[in-house]
């Protein structure tokens, strides 16, 4: 049994007007925008900010006054600021939801060093690998290099989330006092779920500077 408790001053059971409620979603799976109402005869409109309206078609998008909007097969189109709107006694009420998608997309991977790298023996090698991903993506970054078995390298990682459109992951490989055995191919591998990208560079060691 489901009981509605009618409240003309509060059409939605949960109101999120100050800060949107975050809903985690997976593309291809069911997504519920839980703007259930206090009375079954309240008409609710689902909007995606700023201009889109999501129309219930009885199939992919269904309105259920006890649950909210049920989207059977969520797509990228449902990612964003979704607002349930209801007008009661001439007053517009809104409750807001922010759909969050965990992605496995890797936009770009780069080693920010000239290729090939030319270095004097005894000097320090620093390679900076940068992976750019959409928001809500996490990655694993690993290095392979010639003297890996002796764990010659130290690796530092950091994330830059100041960009409003993308995450930028950094992995900085450092090897002190480079030797001849350190010459060869250095590969940065980036993995996010099933997605994988890699980039490599060749490192050459020279005994002394020459023109």
């Amino acid at each position: 049994i489901y009981i509605f408790i009618s409240d003309t001053g509060r059409p939605f059971v949960e109101m999120y007007s100050e800060i949107p409620e975050i809903i985690h979603m997976t593309e291809g799976r069911e997504l519920v925008i839980p703007c259930r109402v206090t009375s079954p005869n309240i008409t609710v409109t689902l909007k995606k900010f700023p201009l889109d309206t999501l129309i219930p078609d009885g199939k992919r998008i269904i309105w259920d006054s006890r649950k909210g909007f049920i989207i059977s097969n969520a797509t990228y189109k449902e990612i964003g600021l979704l607002t349930c709107e209801a007008t009661v006694n001439g007053h517009l009420y809104k409750t807001n939801y922010l759909t969050h998608r965990q992605t496995n997309t890797i936009i770009d991977v780069q080693i920010s060093t000239p290729r090939p790298v030319k270095l004097l023996r005894g000097h320090t090698l620093v390679l900076n690998c940068t992976a750019t991903t959409p928001l809500n993506t996490r990655v694993q970054m690993t290095w392979s290099y010639p003297d890996e078995k002796n764990k010659r390298a130290s690796v530092r990682r950091r994330i830059d989330q100041s960009n409003s459109h993308a995450n930028i992951f950094y992995s900085v490989l450092t090897i002190d006092k480079m030797q001849n055995k350190d010459k060869g191919l250095y590969t940065c591998r980036v993995r996010s779920g099933p997605s994988f990208k890699s980039v490599n560079t060749s490192v050459h060691i020279y005994d002394k500077a020459f023109i």
């Epitope: 100050e18 800060i19 949107p20 900010f49 700023p50 201009l51 889109d52 990228y76 189109k77 990612i79 964003g80 600021l81 517009l92 809104k94 807001n96 959409p134 928001l135 409003s164 459109h165 993308a166």
Partner: antibody, heavy 119, light 110 residues
């Protein structure tokens, strides 16, 4: 790096036309709504138009409705505003901005392109 | 005439706290999120506050926003000389079906 770059501004006579372009880079352009905002010399910000991510829905300010048309080409990562029947009061710096999935405000702006309408 | 109303100017000395108000109506501020933008001389605007009170990454916590009914305000504490700029409030307007801005407030650090 996330960037919006406007182009197409210039000097045009009253009644003339211009098409401004806004090229995006460094983000998934096709996911976000785009806006044009203008600023007359010494004045405040004025919204011009907004287009949804797919390019299927647009909205224009009353001051430009029927004269300006916002559009986008997601394959080129570019938004446009076609400006017809230009008037002296349309003279301004025109900025494009994106409304993204993080803040849903205008969180990335271009540097702007200047439009001068004068005879 | 701007849809949202802001004081044209505000001022303060370094270290002081300054508040800028923004007044609107039920079709804009009351039912939508308020955003604040900072525009330094000769540059494009920059988003300072979103969702009424949230700061994007990189914006100092000296900047704070709030909203009540049809009004919003931006507070800047510990005023610094680099805060001298124009500040605009903005929000979506349901009647207009578009963005609206305040006329801007020129902040002077004395």
């Amino acid at each position: 790096e996330v960037q919006l770059l406007e182009s197409g501004g210039g000097l045009v006579q009253p009644g003339g036309s211009l098409r401004l372009s806004c090229e995006a880079s460094g983000f998934d352009f096709s996911t976000y709504a785009m806006n044009w905002v203008r600023q007359a010399p010494g004045k405040g910000l004025e919204w011009v138009a907004t287009i949804n991510s797919e390019g299927t829905i647009t909205s224009h300010a009353p001051a430009v409705k029927g004269r300006f048309t916002i559009s986008r080409d997601n394959s080129k990562n570019t938004a446009y505003v076609q400006m017809n029947s230009l008037r002296a009061e349309d003279s301004a710096v025109y900025y494009c901005s994106s409304t993204t999935g993080t803040t849903h405000g205008m969180d990335v702006w271009g540097r702007g392109t200047t439009v001068t309408v004068s005879s | 005439q701007s849809v949202l109303t802001q004081p044209p100017s505000a001022s303060g000395t370094p270290g002081q706290r300054v508040t800028i108000s923004c007044s609107g109506s039920s079709s804009n501020i009351q039912n939508n999120y308020v955003y604040w933008y900072q525009q330094l001389p000769g540059t494009a605007p920059k988003l300072l506050i979103y969702f009424n009170s949230q700061r994007p990454s990189g914006v100092p916590d000296r900047f704070s926003g709030s909203k009540s009914g049809t009004s919003a305000s931006l507070a800047i504490s510990g005023l610094q000389s680099e805060d001298e700029a124009d500040y605009y409030c903005g929000t979506w307007d349901d009647s207009l079906n578009g963005w609206v801005f305040g006329g801007g407030t020129k902040l002077t650090v004395l």
